[in-house]
């Protein structure tokens, strides 16, 4: 606890002090006082530098004195033999004696008292920036007029902070400008403009004179501009060293003027104004700006329009243009939006065709559709080449965005039919010779595939079974083969309206209009063993002449068996209708005259006993297309005959092309349209 005074006596004083002693005393007086330490008696063994015995006085880290020997007062009116005055409030006294004393020494008597110190004069470092006032136990600082004492209670400064400038134009100067600015001050000025305007500061070189930098280049007095995270300065010296026009890119600017205790100059003066925040004329590729200007500022709006083939993608929506506004922060709104090449996406697949995986699906890319040749061809033309158009669609020069349609190639067998050994006069055939051949198992009959969804057959085949089971793609109709072949499921049977339905079909004598269509539930996939036959054209080229050759095929009766196991075929010539009329009906169900012969019937056969027979009904009488020798068309359908192995009658398909087309059109699925 600090005390105002005290006494310090050597051990055993006033008796002789013992040998080998070390004793210390810590003196402390209150804060704001110094210590006056004085000795009234001193009798300590004398030695050089007081090496043997001594009393040592220490202030902080400094030795104030070291005493030994005998002392007496010089002043008869004062008992003081030695004294110390320290301006600090702490002092340490240390007494040491060695192992021997040649005489008897009595030691020392000392006293200390707290004394006032003059902080204003007693120290090298002046405690106050301006005026220092001493009092007992302390001091206080004071300031000249218009200065105020800072919170540290030592420094005086000018009250030059707190001004906020909001006007779009203004002038700011250092305190007292052009008279010397105050020392030891920190002046802060704030410019706060409306958002969207940047502060632009202008200075003249001659309007700036601030204490120059030291030898290390550090400004002793300085002017600094702070705009957000950007700083301009510090600046100092005679004449403004920075740019005379400072564009801060910010609506808020802090001006900080810091001065030290020395070297006051006239200071500085500046002007500022608010500029609408400029936005950079950005280079946005593949686009056009409207309006086009040399400079864009706050609140300017531009429409950015993508060039053809480019689009703005925002989320899942594609647009060709967008608006951008110059914002208060000097940045464009929607700056993330870019004109990217239009992406047409993965091209749609097509039935019975393919498109190679494109290397790119962007604007200008090219893809090619192909059909599964040789079984399908591109019906709607256009060559199958599509390019990625500006609107994001794959476009063909002819079809536009419409996809190509792969439709079955008709009338082209994978392998041509070659007659081998004689059979009713026919030969063994392979389904690849007659890929249009359809097998009906109940009743045992035939039909002709004419496209993916339709089978043409004789009306008498389906009149008794409107849900026939049909098979395609197999040469043999053995069970194990049919199980591997394609079974066709009917959706609806359309019998020609001119076909007369009878109570007892077995007694039929009129086979006029013996034609029917079967609509399939699912489309048939074409290939080497399954492929349609063409229909006849309507021109006179398709009128048959006597002697024209046609091919028939089927699993009907042969000389050896009621039903053929493997497909049989024969080539027969067209004959005059009278040839058929002349043949005696084998098992007549009525008078020979009752049998009806019409122009809707073709007579064929009579050569080498080649003929169709029971079980071949509905199969095609295939004739080479007069306009394309590589193709066959269904000129007739096996209908009836007077006697197997002679002449047979075939429905003349040309007479029914309109009905066939109309029926198919009216009963097509949307995907076929």
């Amino acid at each position: 606890e600090p005390t105002m005074y005290g006494e310090i006596l050597s051990p055993n004083y006033p008796q002789a002090y013992p040998s080998e002693v070390e004793k210390s005393w810590d003196i402390e007086v209150p804060e704001g006082y110094g210590i006056h330490l004085y000795f009234t008696h001193l009798d300590i063994e004398l030695s050089e530098n007081c090496a043997y015995d001594s009393v040592q006085i220490i202030s902080g880290d400094t030795e104030e004195g070291r005493l030994c020997g005998q002392r007496s007062s010089n002043n008869p009116h004062s008992p003081i033999v030695e004294e110390f005055q320290v301006p600090y409030n702490k002092l340490q006294v240390i007494f040491k004696s060695d192992f021997s004393n040649e005489e008897r020494f009595t030691g020392f008597a000392a006293y200390y008292v707290a004394t006032d110190i003059n902080e204003c004069t007693d120290f090298v470092d002046v405690p106050c920036s301006h005026f220092c006032n001493n009092f007992i136990g302390g001091y206080f600082c004071s300031c000249p007029p218009e200065y105020f004492l800072h919170d540290d209670m030592k420094n005086c400064g000018v009250n030059c902070s707190g001004d906020v400038f909001t006007a779009l134009i203004g002038e700011i100067a250092s305190p007292n400008y052009p008279k010397p600015y105050p020392e030891n001050s920190r002046c802060e000025y704030q410019i706060r403009l409306e958002k969207g305007f940047q502060v632009v500061v202008t200075l003249r070189r001659e309007d700036f004179d601030v204490e120059a930098a030291d030898s290390a280049g550090n400004c002793l007095d300085s002017l600094v501009f702070v705009a957000g995270d950007r700083q301009f300065g510090p600046y100092c010296g005679h004449g403004f060293p920075g740019p005379l026009n400072i564009e801060t890119k910010s609506n808020a600017l802090d001006i900080i003027f810091q001065t030290d205790l020395t070297g006051q100059k006239k200071g500085w003066k500046l002007r500022y104004h608010g500029d609408p925040m400029p936005c950079p004329k950005e280079d946005t590729p593949n686009s056009v700006w409207e309006p086009a200007k040399a400079k864009y500022v706050f609140r300017d709006v531009v429409q950015i329009t993508c060039l053809d083939g480019f689009e703005v993608v925002e989320g899942r929506v594609g647009a060709t243009s967008f608006y951008s506004t110059c914002q208060s922060n000097g940045k464009w709104s929607n700056s993330k939006l870019k004109c990217q090449p239009v992406d047409c996406g993965i091209p749609e697949s097509i039935e019975n065709g393919k498109v190679e995986d494109p290397e790119s699906t962007l604007f200008g890319s090219v893809i090619r559709y192909t059909c599964e040749e040789p079984y399908y061809y591109m019906e709607n033309g256009g060559g199958g080449e599509y390019h990625c158009a500006g609107n994001g669609s794959w476009v063909n020069e002819v079809l536009g965005p419409e996809l190509p349609k792969c439709v079955p190639v008709c009338g082209v067998p994978r392998e041509p039919f070659e007659e081998k050994q004689r059979i009713i006069g026919g030969s063994d055939a392979d389904i690849k010779n007659f890929p249009w051949q359809v097998f009906f198992d109940n009743p045992w009959a035939g039909g002709a595939l004419i496209n993916e969804y339709w089978v043409l057959t004789a009306a008498h085949v389906v009149e008794g079974n409107r849900e026939p089971t049909m098979y395609v793609g197999s040469t043999s109709v053995q069970t194990s083969r049919l199980a591997k072949s394609k079974m066709l499921t009917p959706e609806h049977v359309f019998i020609h309206p001119g076909w007369k339905l009878l109570e007892v079909p077995e007694g039929r004598t009129n086979f006029d209009n013996d034609i029917a269509l079967v609509r399939l539930k699912d489309p048939v996939k074409m290939g080497p063993t399954v492929s349609p036959i063409c229909l006849p054209g309507t021109s006179s080229d398709y009128n048959l002449m006597d002697g024209d050759l046609g091919l028939i095929s089927g699993w009907g009766r042969t000389e050896k068996r009621d039903r053929a196991v493997r497909l049989k075929a024969a080539r027969l010539p067209v004959a005059p209708l009278r040839k058929c009329k002349e043949v005696k009906v084998e098992k007549p169900t009525a008078d020979a005259e009752a049998y009806v012969f019409t122009p809707n019937m073709i007579c064929a056969g009579g050569e080498k006993g080649m003929d169709s027979c029971k079980g071949d009904s509905g199969g095609a009488f295939a004739v080479q297309d007069p306009n394309d020798k590589t193709k066959f068309y269904a000129a007739g359908l096996v209908s009836w005959g007077p006697q197997c192995g002679t002449y047979g009658l075939y429905t003349r398909v040309k007479n029914y092309v309109d009905w066939i087309m109309k029926t198919m059109q009216e009963n097509s699925t949307p995907r076929e349209d």
């Epitope: 045992w444 040469t475 109709v477 053995q478 069970t479 194990s480 083969r481 049919l482 050896k560 196991v565």
Partner: antibody, heavy 119, light 107 residues
């Protein structure tokens, strides 16, 4: 009408082989597909295999693979089935059967040949 | 090979009863299934082919149904001549396989 006439009953020792013949009349073997089916006494029917003329290969049931050989002599319209490495479980009536058309599995059955395997 | 499982193995019934035999294929066989009737010492007789088609000459009391993997043979009214063993057979893919048989006996 197709008729199938099989060879007579056979008694064989275990480990031996047996060859059963089946003569076709009323049609030619080339027009037909011949299957072989067997039935052990008091047991069920077992399909053994067939010659598939469309593929030109003989197909055997997994169970008989490696032990059975089916052949045809088209000049005599005769089909043969040879079963080797006979064991007592092979005692059965062996039938040759022609394949039917349009979903009918079998058309005509031979009269059957009893093969007895006994030591 | 496709496995065919018939149930039941044995069925006791009386004349006039409605009898149903089930056949299950180990994988889909579409409708390629046949049913046979066999009497002791005789070759099997085809009743039904393609799952539901009645062989000519077979009485209409026999009927078949099903497709895929589940099939049934139904005798609507059992007659004395119908006591026999019945087999199903798949003909979907070579190799063909038979069921193990169902014996229909007099109750």
């Amino acid at each position: 009408e197709v008729q199938l006439v099989q060879s007579g009953a056979e008694v064989k020792k275990p480990g031996a082989s047996v060859k059963v013949s089946c003569k076709v009349s009323g049609d030619t073997l080339t027009e037909l597909s011949m299957h072989w089916v067997r039935q052990a006494p008091g047991k069920g029917l077992e399909w053994m295999g067939t010659f598939d003329p469309e593929e030109g290969e003989t197909i055997y049931a997994q169970k008989f693979q490696g032990r059975v050989t089916m052949t045809e002599d088209t000049s005599t319209d005769t089909a043969y089935m040879e079963l080797s490495y006979l064991r007592s479980e092979d005692t059965a009536v062996y039938y040759c059967v022609t394949e039917g058309l349009a979903g009918i599995p079998f058309d005509s059955w031979g009269q059957g040949t009893l093969v007895t395997v006994s030591s | 090979d496709i496995q065919m499982t018939q149930s039941p193995s044995t069925l006791s019934a009386s004349v006039g009863d409605r009898v149903t035999i089930t056949c299950r294929a180990s994988q889909s066989i579409s409708s390629w299934l046949a049913w046979y009737q066999q009497k002791p010492g005789k070759a099997p007789k085809l009743l039904i082919y393609k799952a539901s088609s009645l062989e000519s000459g077979v009485p209409s009391r026999f009927s078949g149904s099903g497709s895929g993997t589940e099939f049934t043979l139904t005798i609507s009214s059992l007659q004395p001549d119908d006591f026999a063993t019945y087999y199903c057979q798949q003909v979907n893919s070579l190799s063909w396989t038979f069921g193990q048989g169902t014996k229909v006996e007099i109750k």
